[in-house]
């Protein structure tokens, strides 16, 4: 047994240092532009290798039932790249805006870029000298000062434009010990606003020949956000390159060169004056609707995943926003035999599913003051700022003839309570503001509207179960807003917080 | 809640080398930054060095050029290779960890570095 184990080990060895040396990154100090060529990545190392394998042993083997393999028809769901072929080119100090779906590859793309996640095809070229902005502000132990210079040398002009920039003067100036104040242990503690800005302020003092800016206003205020955007990202920095992830309608007509991403892919790269001459159902869409960027940063990427579902290159014709599918919530074969007898009606009771408590200190995704993460079990609706699905489409890995069967299945799976059988989706409906929403990226029905109201206006718990087929009536798919699969990175962001 | 435990602390000649590791457990999925602090007799506790989400690594002045922070982050682990180690490098050496969207901050509970001829 020991000698196969080493056989084994050796072979795989020498597999590894026959494989050809790949230089997908190309850092070059005099370079000033920015590019990324046909970039495709997966989440795991080796993934598309594996990934053309499952394929093929797939084509060979058949299960019993004469369907094909079970794993290998899982694996194809779980195989989607994280990104697929990226294309775009930026010349020294430009701002390249990026926006997109919910789990469409926006911070994996900053990853790539920084030689975190390591592309299968492609090149990426630009000097190495990045600073990089997380869309999770954080702080060390330490003062105000420290935690903005630490590790890079001081320069007091540079400081104090930043400090300027950023809008920490107000802050910075009540305090007695100025910017000698201590954070953290021992010390004051911040808002998630200023917290945002302290950590927009280390990234944009580091020098460097590329800013990484992965949503870097939550917290802040829609007017405190134009602000710190203008004073900060476009004259501060104006002739540094900058790369911002964004969903705002305001920073894509700023920018020099917006790039959408829809699904880990492409879906529009360009000016903003190219995209409405290029797609003006899209653009209009996003602009006619009414202060769209006055929207929670939630609710924008909940829109703006809708429209690009519906107005995706690959899917069919565009739908207007007023027309809606009626198709009946209906089953057939296997699909049926799995459900449960009853169901719940999310107008006879409340809905058990995706209702998240908030606290006064919770409005809008804000987690102000509060000492440790609240822990994410219920919630499908991405919160916060961020905008990246942290929990995904339920059942990832489940089977089917069809891909829209299989994310109707599992939508029923999670009413049931026929995944996830140990997650308690009960809750005393204690507070004032809840969300309701079936999928991270379905924009309000009328149910959800209603059953948000009526949640509002009971303080009962959540128990009446009634029969399923009055839920058929009042659940309908729209096919274009439905995403057919799961992405790689929503299902790898699902792993990672919850590996422990 | 997070834990850190530190490792490799110990009695060195001036000049010498040490590696220190520290591995994070417990509620480990959004880590935002990991790093060391030092604490030097009838001092204040003080950064070293630090290495934050997309590798951004940053050195207090006193230690750079001689101190490289690295991360395993399949493992949560984060290690400090101290090389050309003087006299004045002499502290408790406490791992660091800042995680989750609020920003919480955890501690090892520090491991003695001494050098010392």
């Known amino acids: 047994q020991t000698w196969y184990d080493s056989l084994g080990a050796i072979n795989k060895i020498q597999d590894f240092l026959q494989k050809q040396e790949y230089k997908t990154l190309e850092y070059n100090l005099t370079t000033t532009e920015v590019v990324m060529e046909n970039v495709t990545a997966f989440w795991e190392e080796g993934f598309g290798e594996l990934f053309e394998k499952a394929k093929q042993n797939n084509n060979n083997r058949k299960t019993s039932n004469g369907d094909d393999s079970l794993f290998f028809s899982n694996f194809s769901l779980l195989g989607t790249p994280v990104l697929k072929d990226i294309n775009f080119k930026i010349e020294r100090g430009q701002l390249l805006a990026v926006a997109g779906s919910t789990g469409a590859g926006k911070t994996s793309l900053l990853m790539v870029i920084m030689g975190e996640l390591e592309p299968s095809e492609g090149k990426i070229k630009h000097s190495g000298r990045i600073s990089f902005c997380s869309q999770f502000s954080w702080i060390m132990p330490g003062t105000i000062k420290e935690n903005i210079i630490f590790g890079v040398s001081y320069d007091e002009y540079r400081y104090r434009s930043v400090i300027k920039a950023c809008q920490l003067e107000e802050d910075i100036s009540k305090f007695a010990e100025k910017d000698n104040i201590v954070l953290g242990e021992g010390g004051i503690t911040l808002s998630g606003g200023q917290r945002a800005r302290i950590s927009l302020a280390r990234a944009v003092y580091k020098d460097a020949d590329l800013y990484l800016l992965d949503s870097p206003f939550g917290y802040l205020d829609v007017l405190t956000e134009k602000e710190i955007f203008e004073s900060c990202v476009c004259k501060l920095m104006a002739n540094k390159t900058r790369i911002l992830v964004t969903s705002k309608m305001e920073h894509l007509k700023k920018a020099d060169k917006i790039l959408i991403l829809h699904e880990g892919s492409s879906y529009f790269y360009g000016t903003f004056s190219e995209l409405q001459n290029l797609q003006p159902d899209f653009s209009s869409k996003l602009m006619g609707c009414d202060s769209f960027d006055q929207f929670s940063a939630e609710r924008r990427n909940s829109i703006l995943t809708e429209t690009l579902h519906r107005f995706s290159l690959e899917g069919d014709a565009p739908v207007s926003w007023t027309e809606t599918k009626k198709q009946s919530f209906k089953q057939t074969g296997e699909f049926g035999e799995k459900r449960k007898n009853s169901i719940l009606n999310p107008i006879n009771s409340i809905r058990k599913f995706s209702i998240v408590q908030k606290t006064p200190l919770q409005m809008n995704g804000i987690e102000e003051d509060s000492d440790e993460p609240l822990e994410r079990r219920l919630s499908l609706v991405p919160d916060s700022e961020q905008g990246e699905a942290i929990l995904p489409r339920i059942s990832v890995i489940s089977t089917g003839p069809t891909l829209q069967a299989r994310r109707r299945q599992s939508v029923l799976n999670l009413m049931t309570h026929s995944v996830n059988q140990g997650q308690n989706i009960h809750r005393k409906t204690t507070a004032s503001t809840r969300k309701v929403s079936l999928a991270p990226q379905a924009n309000l029905t009328e149910l959800d509207i209603y059953s948000r109201r009526l949640s509002q206006e009971t303080g009962l718990e959540i128990s009446e179960e009634i029969n399923e087929e009055d839920l058929k009536e009042c659940f309908f798919d729209d096919m274009e807003s439905i995403p057919a699969v799961t992405t790689w990175n929503t299902y790898l962001r699902y792993i990672t917080v919850h590996k422990s | 809640q997070v834990q850190l435990q530190e490792s490799g602390g110990g009695l060195v000649q001036p000049g010498g080398s040490l590696r220190l590791s520290c591995a994070a457990s417990?509620?480990?999925?959004?880590?935002?930054?990991m790093g060391w602090y030092r604490q030097a007799p009838g001092k204040q506790r003080e950064p070293v060095a630090i290495s934050s989400s997309g590798g951004d690594t940053r050195y207090a002045e006193p230690v750079k050029g001689r101190f490289t922070i690295s991360r395993d982050n399949a493992q949560n682990k984060v290690y400090l290779q101290m090389n050309s180690l003087k006299p004045e490098d002499t502290a408790v050496y406490y791992c660091?960890?800042?995680?989750?969207?609020?920003?919480?901050?955890?501690w090892g509970q520090g491991t003695q570095v001494t050098v010392s001829s």
């Open positions: 417990g509620s480990t999925s959004s880590i935002n930054a």
């Open positions: 660091w960890l800042n995680w989750g969207r609020t920003s919480v901050n955890s």
